[in-house]
């Protein structure tokens, strides 16, 4: 029977008695930076080339005995998870191993850096097909390690790393905190976050997605035919490295941004029990479990978007938080969120020739998050149109006036501290979907984009009575690009996108009480690209 | 994910640039910074990654490393260049006393210095 973890990542159409998806990652090379490995294990024999790279610290303790099977344990198991004959994800992928962890599973930032440099030099000397680098390790936050990962990613390499096994915010660890790296948390057979001893998987906004990482059967270095169960975010990352190899083998031209968006898109959504995570981290942690795409081709027609949360701004009065998209992505909308509800909104602004999403804290606020909606939109030309605070009682409005530009998102930003406390709601006039509406004291920012075949529509869901959460989702075939709250309520904490659903959060109803100001309206902007759909059909 | 400039307070020690013997002063107004792991048991003091500014060539990296060694020797300190980086990041890995950090931060082309630290299998 198929091991639970392989079944979990396999779409139903592949599920037979044996896990045999097409293509197997044969066009892709996966680099593994880990312990030494037992390359003659039946699972990985002939699939893994052991490089001569070794940079490890000495083992701790005078009583440590180097036992070959222990030294090879971690790396052998992971190589098996990625490409093992019986229990591997991408059975066709070839691998190269670099030893950066000693027999106790310990390495150094400097050794890892030199290993990454070795990979880059190998890539320059002998360019091959797509490269995936698996980093099943973690240390404390490291600016230099994150920078090296960024450089390698910008050279076209896909880096996949473990979120860490510290039951903590992954942003406090490297390379997990590097934005360019695909960071993977671990879940178990019940789709619960993995507990390991007193700790467990890391979580938070620096995690891209989760994957099976508990009780994973794979190659054991105890003997050439042995298997063993291992657990951790390394095992989860190995699954994603295998899935990435499969995807890149099917579509070798995929960029890192495209691959990440596809990994997110094809993941199982909302299956993780978020109660395991600390309350303040639940909204930041993606509820996604990695899976292979149901078919290796034909995903190109989709408009892919993801949500990127900023770091917390901190509580000072003028504090701001910035969320950025990857270089190949377009920022299509920007929203903000504050647990205290005290914020001064958000705006899209240019920084280094690229749009970023900036959220503003308010006096007495505990801090804000900026939330960027980052999308893949080829040949896009996007700009931000701003309307300053209006004098008229009807509020501030801004629309996309350029020919062929459509509205993808609305933001509003204000200087006064208590905006909306005693103001009646402002309703959007019907028949004007290309328009953002806000309070008269607020600046309103419209994200307007032109791209071949791009069409968007506005969808609203209003609830007259106060409620902690109001949602509105885009229907099948449409992708959520913008998420905001219609102005007029004092207790809105903010808005953010979760997959294809726009979520508007309000203060706990029990504390605000039911008033005439209780109405909450969530506004979603849903887009699709006819151009991408046509291009996909022409390819097929 | 984490912003490049590191929103997380991994200890950052900025030391003001001052003329120091034969060292060229860094470009006006820029201050190299020192970073170390926030988790104390994972720190590896005595080994440092000196990261140079983005467009620094390999020859300049080697020259900067040699300059650090020469200035350290004048002060009676032994240093060892363990690796010169090029291809991904310009810079070098050096084994030296933490006493020399102030000196190293004033070297030309230095962007930041990070103390080495441990990583672990997950």
């Amino acid at each position: 029977s198929i091991p639970w973890n392989l079944e979990r990542i396999t779409p139903p159409r592949y599920r037979a008695d044996e896990y045999q998806p097409p293509d197997g990652g044969s066009l892709v090379e996966v680099y593994l930076l880990d312990t030494s490995i037992q390359s003659d294990h039946r699972e990985i024999e002939g699939r893994v080339m052991v490089t001569d790279f070794e940079n490890v610290p000495e083992e701790d303790g005078t009583r440590f005995h180097r036992q070959a099977s222990k030294c090879d344990s971690h790396g052998t198991h992971l190589a098996g998870v990625v490409s093992g004959r019986d229990a591997g994800v991408a059975k066709g992928a070839s691998m190269r191993s670099l030893r950066v962890l000693n027999c106790q599973g310990k390495g150094t930032v400097s050794g890892t850096l030199i290993g990454l440099e070795f990979i880059r030099k190998s890539q320059l000397v002998q360019p091959v097909g797509p490269l995936v680098v698996l980093l099943p390790l973690a240390g404390g936050y490291s600016r230099v390690l994150n920078a090296a990962c960024q450089r390698l990613a910008r050279a076209g390499v896909v880096l996949v790393t473990a979120a860490g096994n510290f039951r903590d915010d992954a942003c406090l660890y490297s390379p997990a905190s590097a934005p360019e790296v695909i960071t993977v948390g671990a879940t178990n057979a019940q789709d619960q976050p993995v507990t390991l001893g007193t700790l467990g998987t890391n979580f938070g906004r620096c995690v891209d997605l989760f994957a099976p990482g508990e009780d994973i059967i794979g190659a054991s270095s105890d003997c050439s035919t042995c298997f063993v169960s291992q657990s951790g975010t390394s095992q989860a990352a190995a699954h994603v490295a295998g899935i990435a190899a499969m995807m890149l083998s099917a579509e070798p031209e995929l960029t890192l941004a495209e691959l990440r968006q596809r990994l997110i898109h094809f993941s199982a959504k909302d299956v993780i029990n978020e109660a395991w995570f600390p309350e303040d981290q639940r909204v930041l942690t993606p509820n996604l479990v990695a899976a292979l795409p149901p078919s290796t081709h034909g995903a190109g027609w989709q408009l892919f978007c993801r949500t990127v949360w900023s770091a917390h701004s901190g509580p000072t009065r003028m504090a701001t938080a910035v969320a950025r998209c990857a270089p190949d992505e377009e920022l299509l909308s920007c929203s903000s969120f504050s647990r205290s509800g005290k914020r001064r909104g958000e705006r899209m602004e240019a920084q280094g020739g690229k749009l970023v999403c900036r959220a503003h804290n308010a006096f007495g606020g505990e801090g804000v998050y900026a939330i960027a909606r980052c999308c893949l939109l080829p040949q896009a030309n996007c700009s931000v149109h701003t309307a300053p605070p209006a004098e008229a009682s009807m509020g501030t409005r801004v629309h996309c006036h350029q020919q062929g530009h459509v509205l993808t998102g609305c933001s509003s930003h204000w200087e006064v501290e208590d905006l909306g406390t005693h103001k009646p709601p402002v309703l959007r006039p019907r028949g004007q979907p290309n328009q953002c509406v806000g309070h008269r004291e607020a600046s309103i920012h419209a994200s307007c984009c032109h791209a071949p075949g791009l069409e968007c529509k506005v969808k609203e869901h209003g609830i007259p009575a106060p409620q902690e959460q109001v949602t509105v989702a885009c229907e099948e075939g449409w992708t959520l690009t913008g998420c905001s709250a219609l102005p007029g309520t004092s207790h809105v904490l903010g808005a953010y996108a979760v997959d294809n659903t726009c979520v508007v959060r309000s203060r706990d109803v029990s504390t605000t009480g039911s008033t005439s100001e209780g109405a909450v309206t969530a506004v979603a902007i849903c887009c699709r690209s006819r151009h991408l759909a046509q291009a996909s059909q022409e390819l097929q | 994910q984490e912003d490049e400039d590191g929103d997380y307070e991994e200890l950052v020690l900025a030391l003001r640039s001052e003329e120091d013997g034969l060292a060229e002063a860094p470009e006006h107004g820029t201050t190299a910074t020192f970073h170390r792991c926030a988790k104390d048991p994972w720190r590896l003091p005595g080994t440092y990654v000196v990261v140079l500014k983005e467009e620094t060539h390999l020859s300049q990296s080697e020259r900067t490393a040699r300059r650090l060694q020469a200035q350290a020797a004048r002060r009676g300190y032994l240093t060892k260049i363990l690796h010169v980086f090029h291809g991904l990041l310009p810079g070098f890995l050096v084994k030296m006393s933490g006493d020399l950090l102030e000196l190293a931060l004033k070297l030309p082309h230095v962007d930041y210095i990070e103390e080495d630290s441990s990583v672990f299998a997950q």
Epitope: Q104, L196, L199, E214, D215, S220, D222, V228, S231, G232 | -
Partner: antibody, heavy 130, light 107 residues
């Protein structure tokens, strides 16, 4: 689905020997520690011995040390318990069980996380009597 | 060796009752404790591992708690199928010991 089937039980005189076997079906047999547990008539459960995946580590309850030997044959997907110098107090139903557990790493190195005995055989009866 | 003591030895209860079985270790075992259910003539069945984690396929009316030396197994609402003998088991560096068992019978 993993299945465990014990055999080899029977009546034996005090001082005699017996070899119990446990045949496993399902490929995960070789991936886990395995245990023998016994239950004397009308009494509770008593753990007897366990063995690591590759047979390199074995542990025993004090009362059987030096008399019983646990072993496994990965190629045959089988677990064994060689019982020598049998005593009347060894009379029991003997179960083989899979020890579900997993290895994981922390900054301290390699750790073992034990879940419990999640798959059991139906048991084989050993009677030691003259 | 670590001794495990279960209480009570026998427990009479009715369908729908909430019942609690206690297990005490002679020294701290952290959370390394499992609970099993055994019916006459059958092999034991794993219910709870690591003190509080529910084994896959086990009904949610079973729950475990505790750490160190004191542990409890709770059945929130007894069902007819739950009348059986329950054992706790500690794990400590690859050697195990069971409690003497608690027989749960119909009142």
């Amino acid at each position: 689905e993993v299945q465990l089937v014990e055999s080899g039980g029977g009546l034996v005189q005090p001082g005699g020997s017996l070899r119990l076997s446990c045949a496993a079906s399902g490929i995960t047999f070789s991936s886990y520690w395995m245990s023998w547990v016994r239950q004397a008539p009308g009494k509770g459960l008593e753990w007897v011995a366990n063995i690591k995946q590759d047979g390199s580590e074995k542990y025993y309850v004090d009362s059987v040390k030096g008399r019983f030997t646990i072993s496994r044959d990965i190629a045959k997907n089988s677990l064994y318990l060689q019982m020598n110098s049998l005593r009347a107090e060894d009379t029991a139903v003997y179960y083989c069980a899979r020890d579900r557990g997993t290895y994981y790493y922390t900054e301290g190195g390699y750790n073992y996380y034990y879940y419990g005995m999640d798959v059991w055989g139906q048991g084989t009866t050993v009677t030691v009597s003259s | 060796d670590i001794q495990m003591t279960q209480s009570p030895s026998t427990l009479s209860a009715s369908v729908g009752d909430r019942v609690t079985i206690t297990c005490r270790a002679s020294q701290s075992i952290s959370s390394w404790l499992a609970w099993y259910q055994q019916k006459p003539g059958k092999a034991p069945k794993l219910l709870i591992y690591k003190a509080s984690s529910l084994e896959s396929g086990v009904p949610s009316r079973f729950s475990g708690s505790g750490s160190g030396t004191e542990f409890t197994l709770t059945i929130s609402s007894l069902q007819p199928d739950d009348f059986a003998t329950y054992y706790c088991q500690q794990y400590n560096s690859y050697s195990y010991t069971f409690g003497q068992g608690t027989k749960l019978e119909i009142k």
